[in-house]
């Protein structure tokens, strides 16, 4: 199956919206490697230096995380095994809107996909019976 980094892997994202002040999810999936220690997940945001979130070797590595995301991000660690690289974003802010990249590296190769994240004061429509 080739040397690490020489193959492109398929990464899929879904455009989503976040409600200001609530928690949101940026969705990203991939075909998971059975070698979980070889999986690296990085979330980046256009226009921001540093990372939104990094997960590697089975745990978070927030050493390069941008300060605007400090304490507000998490991946679903127990779901990486089934290819879920989605990012949980706590206390969504208006400034969280923008273009995000979900970058995945495995023993087979690497891949990425972008998503547009919209933020606002969305509410469920009232239904009158």
């Amino acid at each position: 199956f080739g040397i690490s980094g020489k193959h492109f892997i398929t990464v899929t994202t879904f455009t989503s919206a976040g409600n200001i002040g609530e928690d949101g999810t940026l969705s990203c999936t991939f075909e998971p490697d059975i070698k979980l220690n070889g999986i690296v997940i990085q979330w980046l945001k256009e226009g921001i230096k540093g990372l939104v979130h990094e997960f590697k070797e089975g745990k978070d590595d927030l050493s390069q995380q941008h300060e605007m995301f400090r304490g507000r991000t998490a991946v679903f660690a127990d779901q990486v095994v089934v290819g879920n690289a989605s990012l949980r974003l706590k206390n969504v802010q208006l400034t969280d809107a923008g273009t995000y990249t979900c970058y995945i590296r495995t023993s087979k190769g690497k891949g990425n996909a972008n998503l547009e994240y919209k933020t606002g004061a969305f509410s469920m429509p009232e239904i009158n019976v």
Epitope: F1, I9, E31, P32, D33, I34, K35, L36, N37, G38, E57, G58, K59, A77, D78, Q79, V81, V82, G83, T106, S107, K108
Partner: antibody, heavy 116, light 107 residues
Framework: EVQLLESGGGLVQPGGSLRLSCAAS????????MHWVRQAPGKGLEWVAS????????YYADSVKGRFTISRDNSKNTLYLQMNSLRAEDTAVYYC?????????WGQGTTVTVSS | DIQMTQSPSSLSASVGDRVTITCRAS??????LNWYQQKPGKAPKLLIY???NLQSGVPSRFSGSGSGTDFTLTISSLQPEDFATYYC?????????FGQGTKLEIK
């Protein structure tokens, strides 16, 4: 009901071949990685091989590498284990298991006996 | 390869007892550890995944803890149906490896 059903086991002479099948039902088979795990009589569990959801990643235990081949047919919801050059030490109950957060669904097992 | 060592290998206990089984990995596996229960002639059953998460349908008397190299399975109050063999398993990397098993017997 989520179910895995193995078949294809039996008695085979050393050096012989067998193909095990694992039929999946009750879940979206193409979304999950799968494993083969075996258990020799009176012994513990031993991982044999794994395959990811779209067959992009395949791994084998050293003890079977070069002799066994794991594969899957997502259109038939079936996992396979082709076993060649069988040895007495391959005698075991062979289980297929779904790869989720843990091996969360197991088949009932199929017995492979390698003996002359 | 990552070696998984369980202790004890066998254990005698009574209904109602609190039982602890430990599992040690030869190197760090983060929280990528599962616990299984197996009864004679049956397939293993997943109890705990990712070190501490209770699998759906498993009684709450089972719990798991630990990360890195040291892990624990605890049964808070043994029931008659809990007498079985228990295995830990790491899924951090290949080869996937199991502990040798802990046989839990009635005292």
């Amino acid at each position: 009901e989520v179910q895995l059903l193995e078949s294809g086991g039996g008695l085979v002479q050393p050096g012989g071949s067998l193909r095990l099948s694992c039929a999946a039902s009750g879940f979206t088979f193409s979304s999950y990685g799968m494993h083969w795990v075996r258990q020799a009589p009176g012994k513990g569990l031993e991982w044999v091989a794994s395959i990811s959801s779209s067959s992009g990643y395949i791994y084998y235990a050293d003890s079977v590498k070069g002799r066994f081949t794991i594969s899957r047919d997502n259109s038939k919801n079936t996992l396979y284990l082709q076993m060649n050059s069988l040895r007495a030490e391959d005698t075991a109950v062979y289980y297929c298991a779904r790869a989720s957060s843990g091996m969360d669904v197991w088949g009932q097992g199929t017995t492979v006996t390698v003996s002359s | 390869d990552i070696q998984m060592t369980q202790s004890p290998s066998s254990l005698s206990a009574s209904v109602g007892d609190r039982v602890t089984i430990t599992c040690r990995a030869s190197q760090s596996i983060s929280s990528y550890l599962n616990w299984y229960q197996q009864k004679p002639g049956k397939a293993p059953k997943l109890l705990i995944y990712a070190a501490s998460n209770l699998q759906s349908g498993v009684p709450s008397r089972f719990s798991g803890s630990g990360s890195g190299t040291d892990f624990t399975l605890t049964i808070s109050s043994l029931q008659p149906e809990d007498f079985a063999t228990y295995y830990c398993q790491q899924y951090y990397t290949t080869p996937l490896t199991f502990g040798q098993g802990t046989k839990l017997e009635i005292k």
